[in-house]
Interface confidence: medium
Protein backbone atom coordinates (compact mmCIF):
# COMPACT_ATOMS: atom_id res chain seq x y z
CA UNK A 1 0.00 0.00 0.00
CA UNK A 2 1.29 3.45 -0.87
CA UNK A 3 0.23 6.93 -1.84
CA UNK A 4 0.45 8.21 -5.38
CA UNK A 5 3.62 10.26 -5.57
CA UNK A 6 2.46 13.25 -7.61
CA UNK A 7 1.89 16.82 -6.40
CA UNK A 8 1.14 18.04 -2.86
CA UNK A 9 -1.97 16.49 -1.40
CA UNK A 10 -4.81 18.99 -0.99
CA UNK A 11 -7.89 18.88 1.21
CA UNK A 12 -8.69 22.61 1.43
CA UNK A 13 -11.88 23.92 -0.15
CA UNK A 14 -13.81 27.21 -0.03
CA UNK A 15 -14.56 28.02 3.60
CA UNK A 16 -12.05 25.49 4.98
CA UNK A 17 -8.31 25.52 5.48
CA UNK A 18 -7.09 21.93 5.56
CA UNK A 19 -3.81 20.04 5.29
CA UNK A 20 -3.14 16.33 4.51
CA UNK A 21 -0.66 14.62 6.81
CA UNK A 22 0.81 11.12 7.05
CA UNK A 23 -0.74 9.23 9.92
CA UNK A 24 0.30 6.36 12.14
CA UNK A 25 -3.36 5.22 12.20
CA UNK A 26 -3.37 6.02 15.92
CA UNK A 27 -4.76 9.49 16.38
CA UNK A 28 -3.94 11.44 19.51
CA UNK A 29 -7.63 11.49 20.46
CA UNK A 30 -7.44 7.74 21.19
CA UNK A 31 -4.91 8.44 23.92
CA UNK A 32 -6.40 11.73 25.15
CA UNK A 33 -10.19 11.45 24.72
CA UNK A 34 -12.23 14.66 24.35
CA UNK A 35 -15.60 15.34 25.92
CA UNK A 36 -17.24 16.65 22.76
CA UNK A 37 -16.83 14.68 19.53
CA UNK A 38 -18.37 14.92 16.05
CA UNK A 39 -20.87 12.48 14.54
CA UNK A 40 -19.86 9.89 11.97
CA UNK A 41 -19.38 10.43 8.23
CA UNK A 42 -22.40 10.00 5.99
CA UNK A 43 -22.66 8.37 2.57
CA UNK A 44 -19.16 6.91 2.31
CA UNK A 45 -18.48 6.00 -1.33
CA UNK A 46 -15.42 4.24 -2.77
CA UNK A 47 -14.85 4.06 -6.49
CA UNK A 48 -12.07 2.88 -8.75
CA UNK A 49 -10.25 5.78 -10.39
CA UNK A 50 -7.05 5.91 -12.39
CA UNK A 51 -4.25 8.44 -11.94
CA UNK A 52 -0.90 9.16 -13.55
CA UNK A 53 2.31 9.59 -11.59
CA UNK A 54 4.79 12.32 -12.42
CA UNK A 55 6.66 9.74 -14.50
CA UNK A 56 3.52 9.13 -16.56
CA UNK A 57 2.72 5.68 -15.15
CA UNK A 58 -0.96 4.88 -14.76
CA UNK A 59 -2.16 3.36 -11.48
CA UNK A 60 -5.52 2.29 -10.07
CA UNK A 61 -6.47 4.37 -7.03
CA UNK A 62 -9.30 4.26 -4.50
CA UNK A 63 -11.43 7.39 -4.82
CA UNK A 64 -12.92 7.95 -1.36
CA UNK A 65 -15.80 10.38 -0.93
CA UNK A 66 -18.07 11.18 2.02
CA UNK A 67 -20.29 13.92 3.34
CA UNK A 68 -20.97 15.38 6.77
CA UNK A 69 -24.17 15.00 8.69
CA UNK A 70 -26.10 18.24 9.10
CA UNK A 71 -25.87 18.56 12.85
CA UNK A 72 -24.16 20.91 15.25
CA UNK A 73 -21.32 18.42 15.88
CA UNK A 74 -19.46 19.85 12.89
CA UNK A 75 -18.46 22.64 15.27
CA UNK A 76 -16.27 20.06 17.03
CA UNK A 77 -14.93 18.38 13.86
CA UNK A 78 -11.15 18.84 13.75
CA UNK A 79 -10.45 16.59 10.77
CA UNK A 80 -10.64 13.01 9.54
CA UNK A 81 -8.48 9.91 9.50
CA UNK A 82 -8.63 7.85 6.29
CA UNK A 83 -7.52 4.25 6.66
CA UNK A 84 -7.07 1.60 3.95
CA UNK A 85 -6.56 -2.01 5.04
CA UNK A 86 -5.50 -4.65 2.51
CA UNK A 87 -7.44 -7.70 3.63
CA UNK A 88 -5.14 -10.50 2.51
CA UNK A 89 -2.00 -9.01 4.11
CA UNK A 90 -3.46 -6.94 6.97
CA UNK A 91 -1.31 -4.05 5.78
CA UNK A 92 -2.77 -0.68 6.68
CA UNK A 93 -2.04 2.84 5.45
CA UNK A 94 -3.56 6.01 6.89
CA UNK A 95 -3.65 9.73 6.16
CA UNK A 96 -5.11 12.51 8.24
CA UNK A 97 -7.09 15.55 7.12
CA UNK A 98 -6.24 18.25 9.66
CA UNK A 99 -8.63 21.19 9.64
CA UNK A 100 -6.84 24.48 10.27
CA UNK A 101 -10.06 26.46 10.55
CA UNK A 102 -13.44 25.73 12.10
CA UNK A 103 -16.25 24.45 9.91
CA UNK A 104 -19.31 26.66 9.57
CA UNK A 105 -22.76 25.67 8.36
CA UNK A 106 -23.46 26.64 4.79
CA UNK A 107 -26.29 25.92 2.39
CA UNK A 108 -24.68 22.94 0.69
CA UNK A 109 -23.69 19.83 2.63
CA UNK A 110 -19.93 19.57 3.28
CA UNK A 111 -18.34 16.99 0.97
CA UNK A 112 -14.78 15.57 1.10
CA UNK A 113 -12.79 13.33 -1.21
CA UNK A 114 -9.35 11.76 -1.51
CA UNK A 115 -7.91 9.85 -4.51
CA UNK A 116 -4.33 9.05 -3.65
CA UNK A 117 -4.31 5.53 -2.23
CA UNK A 118 -2.76 3.25 -4.87
CA UNK A 119 -4.50 -0.13 -4.93
CA UNK A 120 -3.45 -3.46 -6.43
CA UNK A 121 -5.28 -5.46 -9.11
CA UNK A 122 -7.52 -8.20 -7.73
CA UNK A 123 -7.13 -7.15 -4.10
CA UNK A 124 -9.84 -6.38 -1.56
CA UNK A 125 -9.59 -3.47 0.87
CA UNK A 126 -11.48 -2.13 3.84
CA UNK A 127 -11.70 1.66 3.69
CA UNK A 128 -12.54 3.52 6.90
CA UNK A 129 -13.15 7.23 7.46
CA UNK A 130 -12.89 8.27 11.11
CA UNK A 131 -14.00 11.75 12.13
CA UNK A 132 -11.65 13.41 14.60
CA UNK A 133 -11.47 13.58 17.47
CA UNK A 134 -12.41 9.92 17.97
CA UNK A 135 -15.14 9.20 20.52
CA UNK A 136 -14.58 8.50 24.20
CA UNK A 137 -14.43 4.76 25.03
CA UNK A 138 -18.21 4.38 25.57
CA UNK A 139 -19.23 6.97 23.01
CA UNK A 140 -21.09 6.22 19.79
CA UNK A 141 -18.71 5.28 16.97
CA UNK A 142 -17.97 8.12 14.59
CA UNK A 143 -16.50 6.23 11.68
CA UNK A 144 -17.84 4.52 8.59
CA UNK A 145 -16.24 1.57 6.77
CA UNK A 146 -16.76 -0.07 3.39
CA UNK A 147 -15.11 -2.93 1.58
CA UNK A 148 -13.74 -2.29 -1.88
CA UNK A 149 -12.78 -4.98 -4.38
CA UNK A 150 -10.36 -3.93 -7.13
CA UNK A 151 -10.93 -5.72 -10.46
CA UNK A 152 -8.08 -7.90 -11.69
CA UNK A 153 -6.05 -7.38 -14.85
CA UNK A 154 -8.68 -9.03 -17.06
CA UNK A 155 -10.79 -5.90 -16.63
CA UNK A 156 -10.52 -3.65 -19.71
CA UNK A 157 -9.53 -0.45 -17.87
CA UNK A 158 -7.16 -2.27 -15.51
CA UNK A 159 -5.38 -4.04 -18.36
CA UNK A 160 -3.61 -0.85 -19.43
CA UNK A 161 -2.42 0.20 -15.96
CA UNK A 162 1.31 0.00 -15.22
CA UNK A 163 1.07 -2.87 -12.68
CA UNK A 164 -1.03 -4.96 -15.05
CA UNK A 165 1.11 -4.25 -18.10
CA UNK A 166 4.19 -5.12 -16.05
CA UNK A 167 2.68 -8.51 -15.27
CA UNK A 168 1.91 -9.23 -18.91
CA UNK A 169 -1.74 -8.18 -19.20
CA UNK A 170 -1.45 -7.17 -22.85
CA UNK A 171 -0.53 -10.73 -23.86
CA UNK A 172 -3.56 -12.69 -24.98
CA UNK A 173 -2.41 -16.25 -25.67
CA UNK A 174 -5.82 -17.34 -27.00
CA UNK A 175 -5.26 -20.89 -25.74
CA UNK A 176 -6.96 -23.80 -27.45
CA UNK A 177 -6.76 -27.33 -26.06
CA UNK A 178 -7.74 -30.34 -28.13
CA UNK A 179 -7.90 -33.98 -27.06
CA UNK A 180 -6.13 -35.97 -29.78
CA UNK A 181 -6.77 -39.38 -28.18
CA UNK A 182 -6.88 -40.89 -24.69
CA UNK A 183 -3.14 -40.35 -24.39
CA UNK A 184 -2.52 -36.91 -25.89
CA UNK A 185 -3.58 -33.28 -25.59
CA UNK A 186 -2.66 -30.63 -28.11
CA UNK A 187 -2.21 -27.11 -26.77
CA UNK A 188 -2.04 -24.09 -29.10
CA UNK A 189 -1.29 -20.56 -27.98
CA UNK A 190 0.03 -17.25 -29.30
CA UNK A 191 3.55 -16.23 -28.33
CA UNK A 192 4.24 -12.70 -27.05
CA UNK A 193 6.74 -10.28 -28.53
CA UNK A 194 9.55 -11.09 -26.12
CA UNK A 195 12.33 -13.63 -26.28
CA UNK A 196 11.45 -15.37 -23.03
CA UNK A 197 10.62 -18.94 -22.08
CA UNK A 198 7.21 -20.29 -21.08
CA UNK A 199 6.10 -23.11 -18.83
CA UNK A 200 3.02 -25.23 -19.39
CA UNK A 201 1.54 -26.96 -16.36
CA UNK A 202 -0.89 -29.76 -17.07
CA UNK A 203 -3.01 -30.66 -14.04
CA UNK A 204 -5.51 -33.49 -14.33
CA UNK A 205 -8.45 -34.09 -12.01
CA UNK A 206 -11.03 -36.83 -11.47
CA UNK A 207 -14.49 -35.99 -12.87
CA UNK A 208 -16.17 -34.22 -9.93
CA UNK A 209 -13.21 -33.73 -7.60
CA UNK A 210 -10.77 -30.92 -6.95
CA UNK A 211 -7.69 -32.83 -5.84
CA UNK A 212 -5.33 -33.41 -8.73
CA UNK A 213 -4.48 -36.93 -9.84
CA UNK A 214 -1.66 -36.00 -12.20
CA UNK A 215 0.64 -33.07 -12.92
CA UNK A 216 3.19 -32.56 -15.62
CA UNK A 217 5.27 -29.50 -16.39
CA UNK A 218 6.59 -28.74 -19.86
CA UNK A 219 9.20 -26.13 -20.70
CA UNK A 220 9.03 -24.09 -23.90
CA UNK A 221 12.29 -22.36 -24.79
CA UNK A 222 12.38 -18.67 -25.71
CA UNK A 223 11.10 -18.04 -29.24
CA UNK A 224 13.20 -16.22 -31.84
CA UNK A 225 12.08 -12.71 -32.90
CA UNK A 226 10.58 -14.02 -36.14
CA UNK A 227 8.30 -16.26 -34.07
CA UNK A 228 6.83 -13.42 -31.98
CA UNK A 229 3.00 -13.28 -32.18
CA UNK A 230 2.98 -16.66 -33.96
CA UNK A 231 1.00 -19.69 -32.81
CA UNK A 232 2.94 -22.36 -30.95
CA UNK A 233 1.65 -25.88 -30.44
CA UNK A 234 2.63 -28.50 -27.92
CA UNK A 235 1.52 -32.11 -27.64
CA UNK A 236 1.32 -33.27 -24.04
CA UNK A 237 1.27 -36.96 -23.18
CA UNK A 238 -1.27 -37.98 -20.56
CA UNK A 239 -0.95 -40.79 -18.05
CA UNK A 240 -3.68 -43.35 -18.37
CA UNK A 241 -4.95 -43.18 -14.78
CA UNK A 242 -8.41 -44.27 -13.68
CA UNK A 243 -10.95 -41.45 -13.87
CA UNK A 244 -8.24 -38.83 -14.32
CA UNK A 245 -10.08 -37.17 -17.19
CA UNK A 246 -10.48 -33.43 -16.55
CA UNK A 247 -7.41 -31.52 -17.67
CA UNK A 248 -6.40 -27.96 -16.87
CA UNK A 249 -3.62 -26.41 -18.94
CA UNK A 250 -1.94 -23.35 -17.48
CA UNK A 251 0.63 -21.28 -19.37
CA UNK A 252 3.09 -19.25 -17.35
CA UNK A 253 5.27 -16.73 -19.19
CA UNK A 254 8.52 -15.36 -17.78
CA UNK A 255 8.52 -11.82 -19.18
CA UNK A 256 11.37 -9.54 -18.11
CA UNK A 257 8.97 -7.13 -16.40
CA UNK A 258 7.42 -9.74 -14.08
CA UNK A 259 9.83 -12.72 -14.11
CA UNK A 260 8.28 -15.46 -11.89
CA UNK A 261 5.18 -13.42 -11.16
CA UNK A 262 3.57 -12.95 -14.55
CA UNK A 263 -0.15 -13.45 -15.15
CA UNK A 264 -0.96 -17.04 -16.03
CA UNK A 265 -3.61 -18.09 -18.52
CA UNK A 266 -5.44 -21.37 -18.44
CA UNK A 267 -7.92 -23.52 -20.31
CA UNK A 268 -9.78 -26.67 -19.23
CA UNK A 269 -10.90 -29.82 -20.99
CA UNK A 270 -13.85 -31.54 -19.31
CA UNK A 271 -14.30 -35.27 -18.90
CA UNK A 272 -16.15 -36.87 -21.81
CA UNK A 273 -19.91 -37.22 -21.27
CA UNK A 274 -19.90 -40.95 -21.93
CA UNK A 275 -16.53 -42.60 -21.31
CA UNK A 276 -15.21 -44.25 -24.47
CA UNK A 277 -14.15 -47.87 -24.51
CA UNK A 278 -10.56 -47.85 -23.27
CA UNK A 279 -8.00 -48.12 -26.03
CA UNK A 280 -4.99 -50.42 -25.66
CA UNK A 281 -2.26 -48.58 -23.77
CA UNK A 282 1.00 -48.17 -25.65
CA UNK A 283 4.23 -48.96 -23.84
CA UNK A 284 5.16 -46.12 -21.55
CA UNK A 285 8.23 -44.11 -22.22
CA UNK A 286 10.53 -43.50 -19.24
CA UNK A 287 9.41 -41.65 -16.17
CA UNK A 288 13.06 -40.89 -15.50
CA UNK A 289 15.05 -37.86 -16.58
CA UNK A 290 16.73 -38.97 -19.78
CA UNK A 291 20.40 -39.76 -19.27
CA UNK A 292 21.33 -37.64 -22.23
CA UNK A 293 20.28 -34.53 -23.99
CA UNK A 294 16.51 -33.90 -23.64
CA UNK A 295 15.71 -30.26 -23.03
CA UNK A 296 12.17 -31.04 -21.90
CA UNK A 297 11.27 -30.47 -18.28
CA UNK A 298 9.92 -33.68 -16.86
CA UNK A 299 7.56 -33.21 -13.96
CA UNK A 300 5.81 -35.73 -11.79
CA UNK A 301 5.50 -39.01 -13.60
CA UNK A 302 5.63 -37.73 -17.12
CA UNK A 303 5.43 -40.86 -19.16
CA UNK A 304 6.13 -39.48 -22.57
CA UNK A 305 7.84 -36.79 -24.50
CA UNK A 306 6.10 -33.50 -25.09
CA UNK A 307 7.02 -31.70 -28.26
CA UNK A 308 6.32 -28.26 -29.60
CA UNK A 309 6.30 -26.33 -32.86
CA UNK A 310 5.97 -22.66 -33.76
CA UNK A 311 3.76 -21.73 -36.72
CA UNK A 312 4.26 -18.68 -38.91
Amino acid sequence: LRLLDHRALVCSQPGLNCTVKNSTCLDDSWIHPRNLTPSSPKDLQIQLHFAHTQQGDLFPVAHIEWTLQTDASILYLEGAELSVLQLNTNERLCVKFQFLSMLQHHRKRWRFSFSHFVVDPGQEYEVTVHHLPKPIPDGDPNHQSKNFLVPDCEHARMKVTTPCMSSGSLWDPNITVETLDTQHLRVDFTLWNESTHYQILLTSFPHMENHSCFEHMHHIPAPRPEEFHQRSNVTLTLRNLKGCCRHQVQIQPFFSSCLNDCLRHSATVSCPEMPDTPEPIPDYMPLWEPRSGSSDYKDDDDKGSSHHHHHH
Epitope: L201, T203, P206, H211, S212, C213, F214, E215, M217, R239, N240, L241, K242, G243, I281, D283, Y284, L287, W288, Y297, K298, D299, D300, D301, K303
Partner: antibody
Protein backbone atom coordinates in the same frame (compact mmCIF):
# COMPACT_ATOMS: atom_id res chain seq x y z
CA UNK B 1 23.34 -35.63 -7.43
CA UNK B 2 19.73 -35.71 -6.24
CA UNK B 3 19.38 -35.76 -2.47
CA UNK B 4 16.48 -35.51 -0.02
CA UNK B 5 17.66 -34.80 3.52
CA UNK B 6 15.13 -35.09 6.34
CA UNK B 7 15.05 -33.58 9.83
CA UNK B 8 16.05 -35.59 12.91
CA UNK B 9 14.12 -38.04 15.08
CA UNK B 10 11.30 -36.72 17.27
CA UNK B 11 9.64 -37.97 20.46
CA UNK B 12 6.12 -36.63 21.01
CA UNK B 13 3.31 -37.07 23.51
CA UNK B 14 -0.15 -38.24 22.38
CA UNK B 15 -2.25 -35.29 21.17
CA UNK B 16 0.81 -33.25 20.16
CA UNK B 17 1.89 -32.31 16.62
CA UNK B 18 5.05 -33.04 14.66
CA UNK B 19 6.49 -31.27 11.63
CA UNK B 20 9.06 -33.14 9.54
CA UNK B 21 11.16 -31.33 6.94
CA UNK B 22 12.68 -32.63 3.73
CA UNK B 23 15.35 -30.51 2.00
CA UNK B 24 15.89 -31.25 -1.67
CA UNK B 25 19.06 -30.62 -3.65
CA UNK B 26 20.63 -31.62 -6.97
CA UNK B 27 17.61 -30.79 -9.15
CA UNK B 28 15.04 -28.05 -9.81
CA UNK B 29 12.73 -28.35 -6.82
CA UNK B 30 9.55 -27.12 -8.54
CA UNK B 31 9.91 -29.66 -11.33
CA UNK B 32 8.83 -32.65 -9.26
CA UNK B 33 6.25 -33.16 -6.55
CA UNK B 34 7.05 -34.54 -3.10
CA UNK B 35 5.24 -37.55 -1.65
CA UNK B 36 5.26 -38.74 1.94
CA UNK B 37 5.27 -42.43 2.95
CA UNK B 38 5.45 -43.87 6.46
CA UNK B 39 6.42 -47.23 7.90
CA UNK B 40 5.42 -48.39 11.37
CA UNK B 41 8.00 -50.56 13.18
CA UNK B 42 8.18 -53.99 11.54
CA UNK B 43 5.34 -53.08 9.15
CA UNK B 44 4.94 -52.27 5.46
CA UNK B 45 4.87 -48.96 3.62
CA UNK B 46 1.85 -46.63 3.77
CA UNK B 47 1.29 -43.72 1.37
CA UNK B 48 0.32 -40.53 3.21
CA UNK B 49 -0.08 -37.98 0.43
CA UNK B 50 1.56 -35.75 -2.09
CA UNK B 51 2.16 -32.05 -2.70
CA UNK B 52 2.93 -30.29 -5.96
CA UNK B 53 5.98 -28.11 -5.41
CA UNK B 54 4.84 -25.98 -8.34
CA UNK B 55 1.14 -25.38 -7.77
CA UNK B 56 0.73 -26.33 -4.11
CA UNK B 57 -1.96 -28.89 -5.02
CA UNK B 58 -2.20 -31.67 -2.46
CA UNK B 59 -3.72 -35.13 -2.29
CA UNK B 60 -3.92 -36.79 1.13
CA UNK B 61 -4.75 -40.34 2.20
CA UNK B 62 -8.36 -40.45 3.39
CA UNK B 63 -7.48 -41.83 6.82
CA UNK B 64 -5.16 -38.86 7.54
CA UNK B 65 -7.46 -36.17 6.12
CA UNK B 66 -7.87 -33.37 8.65
CA UNK B 67 -4.76 -34.35 10.61
CA UNK B 68 -2.06 -33.97 7.98
CA UNK B 69 -0.83 -30.85 6.17
CA UNK B 70 1.87 -30.83 3.51
CA UNK B 71 3.57 -27.59 2.54
CA UNK B 72 6.64 -26.43 0.64
CA UNK B 73 9.03 -23.51 0.78
CA UNK B 74 10.41 -23.05 -2.73
CA UNK B 75 12.94 -20.45 -1.56
CA UNK B 76 14.76 -23.15 0.44
CA UNK B 77 13.69 -26.18 -1.68
CA UNK B 78 12.15 -27.73 1.41
CA UNK B 79 8.95 -29.75 1.84
CA UNK B 80 7.20 -30.13 5.18
CA UNK B 81 4.74 -32.68 6.55
CA UNK B 82 2.83 -31.81 9.72
CA UNK B 83 0.79 -34.43 11.54
CA UNK B 84 -1.50 -33.29 14.35
CA UNK B 85 -3.34 -35.04 17.23
CA UNK B 86 -0.69 -37.72 17.36
CA UNK B 87 -1.60 -41.21 18.59
CA UNK B 88 0.62 -44.11 19.56
CA UNK B 89 -0.10 -45.83 16.22
CA UNK B 90 1.48 -42.84 14.42
CA UNK B 91 4.86 -44.09 15.68
CA UNK B 92 6.72 -44.75 12.45
CA UNK B 93 9.59 -43.79 10.18
CA UNK B 94 8.36 -41.00 7.90
CA UNK B 95 9.91 -40.77 4.43
CA UNK B 96 9.70 -38.05 1.83
CA UNK B 97 10.12 -39.17 -1.75
CA UNK B 98 10.35 -37.38 -5.07
CA UNK B 99 7.51 -37.55 -7.61
CA UNK B 100 3.76 -37.91 -7.49
CA UNK B 101 3.01 -41.45 -8.57
CA UNK B 102 6.22 -43.42 -8.59
CA UNK B 103 9.04 -42.51 -6.22
CA UNK B 104 12.52 -42.30 -7.72
CA UNK B 105 14.46 -40.76 -4.80
CA UNK B 106 13.79 -41.12 -1.09
CA UNK B 107 14.88 -39.25 2.04
CA UNK B 108 16.74 -41.17 4.76
CA UNK B 109 13.62 -41.23 6.95
CA UNK B 110 12.64 -39.55 10.22
CA UNK B 111 11.64 -41.67 13.21
CA UNK B 112 8.68 -40.18 15.08
CA UNK B 113 7.92 -41.87 18.39
CA UNK B 114 4.60 -41.12 20.08
CA UNK B 115 4.64 -42.11 23.72
CA UNK B 116 3.22 -40.83 26.97
CA UNK C 1 -8.96 -48.55 -2.67
CA UNK C 2 -6.91 -51.06 -4.64
CA UNK C 3 -5.52 -53.82 -2.41
CA UNK C 4 -2.09 -55.18 -3.35
CA UNK C 5 -1.31 -58.72 -2.19
CA UNK C 6 2.23 -60.07 -2.30
CA UNK C 7 3.22 -63.72 -2.11
CA UNK C 8 4.92 -65.47 -0.59
CA UNK C 9 5.40 -63.49 2.62
CA UNK C 10 8.87 -65.05 2.97
CA UNK C 11 11.00 -66.65 0.28
CA UNK C 12 14.06 -68.72 1.24
CA UNK C 13 16.57 -68.92 -1.60
CA UNK C 14 20.21 -69.89 -1.89
CA UNK C 15 22.69 -67.42 -3.44
CA UNK C 16 22.93 -67.90 -7.20
CA UNK C 17 19.39 -69.26 -7.45
CA UNK C 18 16.44 -67.63 -9.16
CA UNK C 19 13.78 -65.85 -7.08
CA UNK C 20 10.25 -65.17 -8.31
CA UNK C 21 8.07 -62.75 -6.34
CA UNK C 22 4.38 -62.26 -7.03
CA UNK C 23 2.12 -59.23 -6.63
CA UNK C 24 -1.62 -59.26 -7.27
CA UNK C 25 -3.95 -56.23 -7.49
CA UNK C 26 -7.61 -56.39 -6.41
CA UNK C 27 -8.50 -54.74 -9.73
CA UNK C 28 -6.64 -53.91 -12.92
CA UNK C 29 -3.86 -51.36 -12.51
CA UNK C 30 -2.82 -51.50 -16.16
CA UNK C 31 1.00 -51.26 -16.17
CA UNK C 32 1.10 -48.65 -13.40
CA UNK C 33 3.14 -50.72 -11.00
CA UNK C 34 6.52 -50.29 -9.29
CA UNK C 35 8.83 -52.54 -7.28
CA UNK C 36 11.06 -51.40 -4.40
CA UNK C 37 13.79 -53.10 -2.39
CA UNK C 38 14.29 -52.27 1.30
CA UNK C 39 17.07 -53.35 3.62
CA UNK C 40 16.88 -52.99 7.42
CA UNK C 41 17.39 -49.41 8.59
CA UNK C 42 17.38 -48.05 5.02
CA UNK C 43 14.91 -46.22 2.80
CA UNK C 44 13.27 -48.17 -0.03
CA UNK C 45 15.22 -48.28 -3.28
CA UNK C 46 13.39 -48.13 -6.64
CA UNK C 47 13.91 -51.16 -8.88
CA UNK C 48 11.17 -51.29 -11.51
CA UNK C 49 8.49 -48.86 -12.72
CA UNK C 50 5.75 -49.19 -15.34
CA UNK C 51 5.73 -52.93 -14.46
CA UNK C 52 8.83 -53.80 -16.48
CA UNK C 53 11.21 -50.83 -16.87
CA UNK C 54 14.36 -50.97 -14.76
CA UNK C 55 15.24 -47.85 -12.78
CA UNK C 56 18.58 -46.17 -13.33
CA UNK C 57 21.51 -48.17 -11.95
CA UNK C 58 19.51 -51.35 -11.29
CA UNK C 59 21.38 -54.53 -12.35
CA UNK C 60 19.99 -56.57 -15.27
CA UNK C 61 19.34 -59.59 -13.02
CA UNK C 62 16.19 -57.77 -11.83
CA UNK C 63 13.25 -57.94 -14.23
CA UNK C 64 9.55 -57.16 -13.94
CA UNK C 65 6.62 -58.49 -15.93
CA UNK C 66 2.84 -58.55 -15.97
CA UNK C 67 -0.05 -56.15 -16.50
CA UNK C 68 -3.62 -55.79 -15.29
CA UNK C 69 -3.80 -57.63 -11.97
CA UNK C 70 -0.85 -60.06 -11.92
CA UNK C 71 2.78 -58.99 -11.70
CA UNK C 72 6.10 -60.71 -11.15
CA UNK C 73 9.53 -59.56 -10.03
CA UNK C 74 12.27 -61.98 -11.01
CA UNK C 75 15.82 -61.97 -9.66
CA UNK C 76 17.66 -64.29 -12.05
CA UNK C 77 20.66 -65.11 -9.86
CA UNK C 78 20.54 -63.95 -6.25
CA UNK C 79 23.56 -62.10 -4.92
CA UNK C 80 24.28 -61.66 -1.22
CA UNK C 81 23.22 -57.98 -1.42
CA UNK C 82 19.78 -58.95 -2.78
CA UNK C 83 18.53 -60.41 0.53
CA UNK C 84 15.97 -57.81 1.60
CA UNK C 85 12.25 -57.04 1.67
CA UNK C 86 10.57 -56.28 -1.68
CA UNK C 87 7.41 -54.17 -2.06
CA UNK C 88 5.15 -53.63 -5.02
CA UNK C 89 3.15 -50.37 -5.39
CA UNK C 90 0.32 -49.42 -7.72
CA UNK C 91 -0.09 -45.88 -9.04
CA UNK C 92 -3.08 -46.41 -11.28
CA UNK C 93 -5.58 -44.96 -8.82
CA UNK C 94 -5.69 -42.91 -5.63
CA UNK C 95 -4.90 -43.67 -2.91
CA UNK C 96 -1.55 -45.12 -3.94
CA UNK C 97 -1.15 -48.51 -2.24
CA UNK C 98 1.71 -50.88 -1.45
CA UNK C 99 1.76 -54.63 -1.06
CA UNK C 100 2.61 -56.10 2.34
CA UNK C 101 6.10 -57.09 1.19
CA UNK C 102 8.02 -60.28 0.49
CA UNK C 103 11.09 -61.03 2.58
CA UNK C 104 13.81 -62.77 0.59
CA UNK C 105 16.10 -64.59 3.02
CA UNK C 106 19.13 -66.84 2.71
CA UNK C 107 18.26 -70.52 2.62
Amino acid sequence: QVQLVQSGAEVKKPGASVKVSCKASGYTFTRYGISWVRQAPGQGLEWMGWISTYSGNTNYAQKLQGRVTMTTDTSTSTAYMELRSLRSDDTAVYYCARRQLYFDYWGQGTLVTVSS
Amino acid sequence: EIVMTQSPATLSVSPGERATLSCRASQSVSSNLAWFQQKPGQAPRPLIYDASTRATGVPARFSGSGSGTDFTLTISSLQSEDFAVYYCQQYDNWPLTFGGGTKVEIK
